[in-house]
């Protein structure tokens, strides 16, 4: 009778993360006697992956019963496959013996590859808001895919940006993958409603490309521009001064207004309208007795915003 | 598991004519469906793609010549305006539902003749 | 675009034989290649996928083998079925587009 041949007809099988593995496996023989053990690897270093005659193998099942007398078939199938489990499976039939068990015979070997898709891709912004005309910096970055191969592009509200540098790593080889990406940004006063979006395309996403996206009004501050006017006089001797705040971004705004440079009055910001590029106007008023003046009065608009140093806008109050 | 394309006919140059690919045993939101060609005793020729978020892509040479859509069981491709050289076995087929890069179930095909 | 050369375009074996057909990409396309028989009248039929995986219920005569630019579809033991057009496919990452190359006959000698 011929010796048992293990048969691995498999030289390579690809599956995608998450799905189960089939490992096939077939003896020419019931001759000799012993039980089958699934590896990882081969050498002193390689892995058990099942042993038919003990252990408990959660992830592992076969695909005949083993218990059966005449079986030949040794198959495996291994669930919740992960990148991790990426590599060559040994099927080795063993010869019964005393006290151990001894290796008799190995398959050829099946490689097992694995497809993962990437992750969401996550875009981040700079820590601190920038002002227009400043070149701020986004990262994105996306992991667990496999194969390495992945392309990224950078939009800004639908046009694609060239001023980016990424990165794949590790740069040889590995089960699975991430991407590094950083893209500079030129920001314009128009930029409160705009959108920077990084757009990562890979073989195993059957939709469009997946897409992080990071709002710029978060990453924007676009600061006032300040007019003092003064009304016609009221009566009663009382002057009207408006302070326009106009153009700005975020909300977060203090008035303080200062006649001669003494406090007069402080107030914050809430009741402003929005124009149409995300921007905020507001507008603040004092009345000025101007009879209890002698000299001319040095109006002063001062505005703190978002945390800045104060801008300033002073108007000369005739006292005739 | 199953692909069939349908539309197929004579058409005259410069007509319309659109073609359809009825699908079973699966879902289009979940898979990106193909669109080739094949002429009389030539090779197989890639016209586009619809992904299963429904956003069509085409081959360079197609030029809006073509335009590809779908609905839940079916993807179509419109042809806008026939030329002779556009006589053909059309078909449809599936991405592998391990990557892009391979079909694995395709449809029998549908004859489009243009002639005047 | 990428283009596809296949080689030889026609070839004539006899059952039992080994028979190989090349496939060159004119840049790398990695590992994205697949395989098909087409029989006439009927659709592509997939054999291989990833350069190198055998489609489910191909028969284990068929292989494939390559990666980057040069690929090989080999038969080791050419069966009366076999007898067909064989094409390449690749896909390329970048581009996202598919290219088929130009096909191989195989007749019997």
């Known amino acids: 009778e011929e010796e048992l041949q293990v048969i691995q007809p498999d030289k390579s099988v690809l599956v995608a993360a998450g799905e189960t593995a089939t490992l096939r496996c077939t003896a020419t023989s019931l001759i000799p006697v012993g039980p089958i053990q699934w590896f990882r690897g081969a050498g002193p270093g390689r892995e058990l992956i099942y042993n038919q005659k003990e252990g408990h193998f959660p992830r592992v099942t076969t695909v005949s019963d083993l218990t059966k007398r005449n079986n030949m078939d040794f198959s495996i199938r291994i669930g919740n496959i992960t990148p991790a489990d990426a590599g060559t499976y040994y099927c080795v039939k063993f010869r019964k013996g005393s006290p151990d068990d001894v290796e008799f015979k190995s398959g050829a070997g099946t490689e097992l590859s694995v497809r993962a898709k990437p992750s969401a891709p996550v875009v981040s912004g700079p820590a601190a808001r920038a002002t227009p005309q400043h070149t701020v910096s986004f990262t994105c970055e996306s992991h667990g895919f496999s194969p390495r191969d992945i392309t990224l592009k950078w939009f800004k509200n639908g046009n694609e940006l060239s001023d980016f540098q990424t990165n794949v790593d590790p740069v040889g080889e590995s089960v699975s993958y991430s991407i590094h990406s950083t893209a500079k940004v030129v920001l314009t006063r128009e930029d409160v409603h705009s959108q920077v979006i990084c757009e990562v395309a890979h073989v195993t996403l059957q939709g469009d490309p997946l897409r992080g996206t990071a709002n710029l009004s978060e990453t924007i501050r676009v600061p006032p521009t300040l007019e003092v006017t003064q009304q016609p006089v009221r009566a009663e001797n009382q002057v009207n001064v408006t302070c326009q705040v106009r153009k700005f971004y975020p909300q977060r705004l203090q008035l303080t207004w200062l006649e001669n440079g003494n406090v007069s009055r402080t107030e914050t910001a809430s009741t402003v309208t929005e124009n149409k590029d995300g921007t905020y106007n507001w507008m603040s008023w004092l009345l000025v007795n101007v009879s209890a003046h002698r000299d001319d009065v040095k109006l002063t608009c001062q505005v703190e915003h978002d945390g800045q140093p104060a801008v300033s806008k002073s108007h000369d109050l005739k006292v005739s | 598991v199953q692909l069939v394309e349908s539309g197929g006919r004579l058409g005259q140059p410069g007509t319309p004519l659109t073609l359809s690919c009825t699908v079973s045993?699966?879902?289009?939101?979940?898979?990106?469906m193909g669109w080739f060609r094949q002429a009389p005793g030539k090779g197989l020729e890639y016209i586009g793609i619809?992904?299963?978020?429904?956003s069509p892509y085409y081959a360079s040479w197609v030029n809006g010549r073509f335009t590809i859509s779908k609905t839940s069981t079916t993807m179509d491709l419109k042809m806008n305006s026939l030329r002779s050289e556009d006589t053909a076995t059309y078909f449809c087929?599936?991405?592998?539902?391990?990557?892009?890069?391979?079909?694995?179930?395709w449809g029998p095909g549908t004859l489009v003749t243009v002639s005047s | 675009d990428i283009q596809m050369t296949q080689s030889p375009s026609s070839l004539s074996a006899s059952v039992g034989d080994r028979v190989t057909i090349t496939c060159r990409a004119s840049?790398?396309?990695?590992?994205?290649l697949a395989w098909y028989q087409q029989k006439p009248g009927k659709a592509p039929k997939l054999l291989i996928y990833s350069a190198s995986f055998l489609y489910s219920g191909v028969p284990s005569r068929f292989s494939g083998s390559g990666s980057g630019t040069d690929f090989t579809l080999t038969i080791s033991s050419l069966q009366p079925e076999d007898f067909a057009t064989y094409y390449c496919q690749s896909w390329h990452y970048i581009s996202r587009s598919y290219t088929f190359g130009q096909g191989t006959k195989v007749e019997i000698k």
């Open positions: 087929a599936r991405v592998g539902p391990l990557g892009v890069d391979y079909f694995n179930i």
């Open positions: 619809i992904s299963s978020s429904g």
């Open positions: 045993g699966f879902s289009l939101s979940s898979y990106v």
């Open positions: 840049q790398s396309i990695n590992s994205y």
